[in-house]
């Protein structure tokens, strides 16, 4: 090899890099050395490139032509085929033609950002250049033609289209199976249609922040089964509907901050089983409903700061067993911390909870129940006045506790806190000073001697009358009463909550009077009126009485609204045969749903029940008796009962039975002059009519023949020989006829024969 060519006159050299940047060049230097691998021509005044200037640069791989005045993608002559990276950002290029790129057979990185490109047509990027990274950010692209990047499908890994003017993405806009990063932030996209990104099988990061997206159609991200990170910050989303997340099975991070999301729907998160971080900060959330994120069992970080969350339902975080960090800074969840217990249940792995700036005035003892493993708790930015004993005690792993408040009510109830903080070595991040009593104002709680934490008065309201659980009938007026006492003259405000949410237009009556037992103590009473109650009034009611020193929360009184049962189906009288099945219907409505019970003849111990022949079908309001017996006949009562009362309806069951003989009719032998009785004891329903026959004819009655009124007993007195014969008892009712026979034999009268033997 000959001697190394010198550096170009207008440039500087370092190794195999030639730096001709920022030299005010309007044309290429003519003496570019052949060993150049990296050529920097940026920050010049080049408006066109002479391809001939690149004839003898066999090693050239990197060309920096950014910040010039080029209006088209230049040709680098013979060098085009081996250039790997071409930087053309910040020029005046208006369009890209496929013919301009065809020669770049080795091109992997192409930066066309900050130019004047207005559209990308499917002729722009031909098959050929193995471009891995394409940057089109900061142009004026408004149109993306379908298939515009198809020519790069075998190679493209990163595509940057941020800061353009794209308003719409065609469905299946990208057929780039190797693409891992797609940046579309700072455009004007309003809607993501279903299947928009189908064809991006390998995509891992999708940036859509700072658009104007207001709707994600079902299946919007379908096909992105390998995507790990989705950025949707700074858009106009009002909800995350379930179908839009369909297909995001590998998603790790979902960034949704700075939207207008007002509700978290429970459905849909099941498609994101691997979600690790969910950012919903700076939205319009006002509440977290029960189990609204229950499907996200792998979620580790949940950021909900800067919303307007004022209500966290008990069990709102149920299912988030892997959550380690929960950020709730700058919300309005004071009520959750001051009163609720169970809001944080389910967060078994939580190690960091931040509640900075939530207007928390007091910390209830069970506020953090379920967070026994917590290591970091931030309550800074809250004008905390009191912390109940036990509030932090169960957090055995707590390493950092942030409190910054100059509003503490330094009374006997706070006395436990300073020594506990010191004993647990948690005082480092606690800035806590007294606001009351006046004698301690401005003093750190750590410098107040224990004997000064006294309760000579009770400034914070204390509940003395709790609202009581009640039951009301629909349409009635009811009232809840709550009263509290305080020794402070600080103005008192009253609020009522239903199911942990403040009733904004509550019909309440408030009054105050001097407490009888102690002239210096004021008693404040609030009465909540509920007029003409409906089922919508049902729930748990609680009063909140607040003054400058804090809020006091009453017990929760339950209101149950009832409606007396009324029948929708009543049983009817029925008549059936024995051995068949009896069916009685009975159904009732009411609130709560009435229970149906059956009785027979006023009792619950009846044959069908005893013999397990009774079957109640709760779902279709039917009462069955199988293999009906005559004993089952009677009056059946259906009673519908709920807490409002009970009603009854009766039906008579009549059981029909074909006639039959209870006792068999037997043949008889009697002597003349004796009396004989033939009994035809019959059963059946209706009771059978009995007729007697002698031979084939109806029995002729004489003064010697007597029948009981029901014909069941036939008595023949002073039997004569002519009475002998075949007697038939015929039993008849509407179901049929049964016959029984008896052969009557008559012997001569008893007496002595001449030979001394006895007759008879």
């Amino acid at each position: 090899a000959g001697p190394r060519a010198p550096c170009a006159a207008a440039c500087t050299c370092a190794g195999d890099s030639l730096d001709c940047g920022g030299r005010g060049l309007a044309a290429l230097p003519g003496d570019l050395p052949s060993w150049t691998r990296s050529l920097n021509l940026s920050y010049n005044k080049l408006s066109e490139i002479d391809p001939a200037g690149f004839e003898d640069l066999p090693n050239l791989q990197e060309v920096y032509l950014n910040n010039n005045e080029l209006t088209a993608v230049p040709s680098l002559g013979a060098a085009s085929s081996h250039v790997v990276s071409l930087f053309l950002q910040h020029n005046k290029i208006r369009s890209v033609e496929g013919s301009q790129l065809k020669a770049y057979l080795s091109l992997e990185v192409l930066d066309l950002s900050l130019n004047n490109i207005t559209e990308v047509r499917n002729t722009c990027f031909p098959h050929g250049p193995p471009i891995k990274e394409l940057n089109l950010a900061g142009n004026r692209i408004g149109t993306l033609e379908l298939g515009a990047f198809d020519g790069l499908s075998r190679s493209l890994l990163t595509l940057r289209l941020s800061k353009n003017r794209i308003t719409q993405l065609p469905v299946r806009a990208f057929k780039l199976p190797r693409l891992t990063q797609l940046d579309l932030n700072r455009n004007r996209i309003r809607l993501i249609e279903g299947l928009t990104f189908q064809g991006l099988n390998s995509l891992e990061v999708l940036k859509l922040q700072r658009n104007n997206i207001s709707k994600l159609t079902d299946g919007a991200f379908w096909g992105l089964s390998k995507m790990h990170v989705l950025h949707l910050e700074y858009n106009s989303l009002v909800e995350v509907n379930s179908g839009s997340l369909y297909g995001l099975t590998a998603l790790h991070q979902l960034h949704l901050s700075n939207n207008s999301i007002a509700r978290i729907h429970r459905k849909g998160w099941s498609f994101c089983q691997k979600l690790h971080e969910l950012v919903l900060s700076f939205n319009n959330l006002t509440r977290l409903d029960e189990e609204s994120l229950a499907e996200l069992s792998s979620l580790s970080v949940l950021r909900l700061s800067h919303n307007s969350i004022s209500h966290i339902a008990e069990g709102a975080f149920k299912g988030l067993r892997s959550l380690r960090v929960l950020d709730l800074d700058h919300n309005e969840i004071s009520g959750t911390i001051e009163d609720t217990s169970g809001a944080f249940s389910g967060l078994d792995s939580l190690s960091k909870l931040t509640l900075f700036g939530n207007k928390i005035k007091s910390v209830a003892k069970r506020a953090f129940s379920g967070l026994e493993g917590l290591e970091h708790l931030n309550l800074g930015g809250n004008a905390i006045r009191s912390v109940q004993f036990d509030a932090f005690v169960k957090m055995k792993n707590l390493k950092e506790l942030h409190i910054s408040s100059d509003s503490f009510l330094c009374d006997c109830q706070l006395k436990w806190l300073p020594p506990w903080l010191i004993g647990r070595m948690l005082q480092a991040f606690v800035t806590a000073t007294c606001a009351h009593p006046e004698s301690l104002k401005g003093q750190s709680i750590f410098s107040v001697p224990p004997e000064s934490f006294v309760c000579d008065d009770f400034l914070k309201p204390q509940i003395i009358t709790q609202p009581e659980t009640t039951m009301a009938m629909v349409g009635k007026d009811i009232r809840f009463t709550c009263s509290a006492a305080s020794s402070s003259s600080s103005p008192m405000t009253f609020a009522w909550k239903k199911d942990n949410e403040v009733l904004t237009n509550a019909d309440m009556e408030n009054f105050v009077h001097v407490h009888a037992q102690d002239g210096e103590v004021m008693e404040y009473t609030t009465i909540l009126h509920l007029r003409q109650v409906t089922f919508g009034h049902e729930g748990r009611y609680q009063c909140v009485i607040t003054n400058h020193f804090g809020s006091t929360y009453s017990h929760k009184a339950r209101l149950t609204v009832n409606v007396l049962p009324s029948f929708t189906k009543t049983p009817h009288d029925i008549t059936i045969r024995t051995t068949t099945m009896a069916r009685l219907e009975c159904a009732a409505t009411g609130h709560p749903n009435p229970q149906i019970a059956w009785q027979k003849d006023g009792g619950t111990d009846f044959p069908a029940a005893r013999e397990r022949r009774m079957h109640v079908m709760p779902d279709d309001d039917v009462f069955f008796i199988t293999d009906v017996k005559i004993d089952d006949a009677g009056v059946y009562s259906c009673t519908a009962q709920n807490s409002a009362g009970s009603i009854s309806a009766n039906a008579t069951l009549t059981v029909l039975e074909t006639p039959s003989l209870v006792v068999p009719l037997e043949d008889r032998v009697v002597s003349v002059g004796e009396t004989v009785a033939l009994q035809c004891k019959a059963t059946g329903n209706p009771p059978p009519r009995i007729t007697w026959f002698k031979g084939d004819r109806p029995l002729s009655l004489t003064e010697r023949h007597h029948l009981t009124p029901d014909n069941q007993l036939l008595v023949v007195q002073n039997v004569v020989a002519e009475d002998a014969g075949r007697y038939t008892c015929e039993m008849s009712n509407t179901l049929g006829t049964e016959r029984a026979h008896s052969q009557l034999s008559v012997l001569p009268a008893a007496g002595c024969r001449k030979d001394g033997t006895t007759v008879g």
Epitope: K415, G423, R424, C455
Partner: antibody, heavy 121, light 110 residues
């Protein structure tokens, strides 16, 4: 003048039950934490159970957990201790004690005279 | 075995100064104020010292309390025969979630 008067002690067989009462007067009962403390014959003091005012949170020594139940009736100014499944080692004088303030970690500034519970067959 | 450790006995002659110690851990004495109780023979216990060193009204200033770290002590100066009693230290224990007493120290005035 603060007064605490225990009652309900007596002889009971192992496995049996007993309910102790403590009638309080001379202070606003509903504002103070209350406890039961016992002392076995010739032994030291052992805290048994305590109950907060207001929300009536309850606390128990491990030795009685699940067997004893503390409760209070603020309207009657009375503290109770329901003792079930009694054992010989529960034999002691049971004292009712008033907390200095409303928190459980406060000292006991007033004590009753005690009631003797004897568990024996 | 008590959670708080006290010497079983102590003694002194009239006029002398006697000190009774009480040793605990970070979950009790280390995180809480300590109280001392006096139990005269055949009577109910009586609060003698609270909040480590405070005396309720009626308790003579011969009785004083102090605390350092996880140990506390009760000092009785100018010992008198009526001081002969059992003395118990007590405090809340956050690990046990309950109140704990020392085993008691029997003070004999010789």
């Amino acid at each position: 003048e603060v007064q605490l008067l225990e009652s309900g002690g007596g002889l009971v067989q192992p496995g049996g039950s007993l309910r102790l009462s403590c009638a309080a007067s001379g202070f606003t009962f509903s504002n103070y934490y209350m406890s039961w403390v016992r002392q076995a014959p010739g032994k030291g003091l052992e805290w048994v159970s305590g109950i907060s005012p207001g929300d009536s949170s309850t606390y128990y020594a491990d030795s009685v957990k699940g067997r004893f139940t503390i409760s209070r009736d603020n309207s009657k100014n009375t503290l109770y201790l329901q003792m079930n499944s009694l054992r010989a080692e529960d034999t002691a004088v049971y004292y009712c004690a008033k907390g200095l303030y409303s928190n459980p970690n406060e000292p006991f500034d007033y004590w009753g005279q005690g009631t003797l519970v004897t568990v024996s067959s | 075995q008590s959670v708080l450790t006290q010497p079983p006995s102590a003694s002194g002659t009239p006029g002398q100064r006697v000190t009774i110690s009480c040793t605990g851990s970070s979950s009790n004495i280390g995180s809480n104020y300590v109280s001392w109780y006096q139990q005269l023979p055949g009577t109910a216990p009586k609060l003698l010292i609270y909040d480590d060193s405070q005396r309720p009204s009626g308790v003579p200033d011969r009785f004083s309390g102090s605390k350092s770290g996880t140990s506390a002590s009760l000092a009785i100066s100018g010992l008198r025969s009526e001081d002969e009693a059992d003395y118990y230290c007590g405090t809340w224990d956050y690990s046990l979630n309950g109140y704990v007493f020392g085993g008691g120290t029997k003070l004999t005035v010789l």
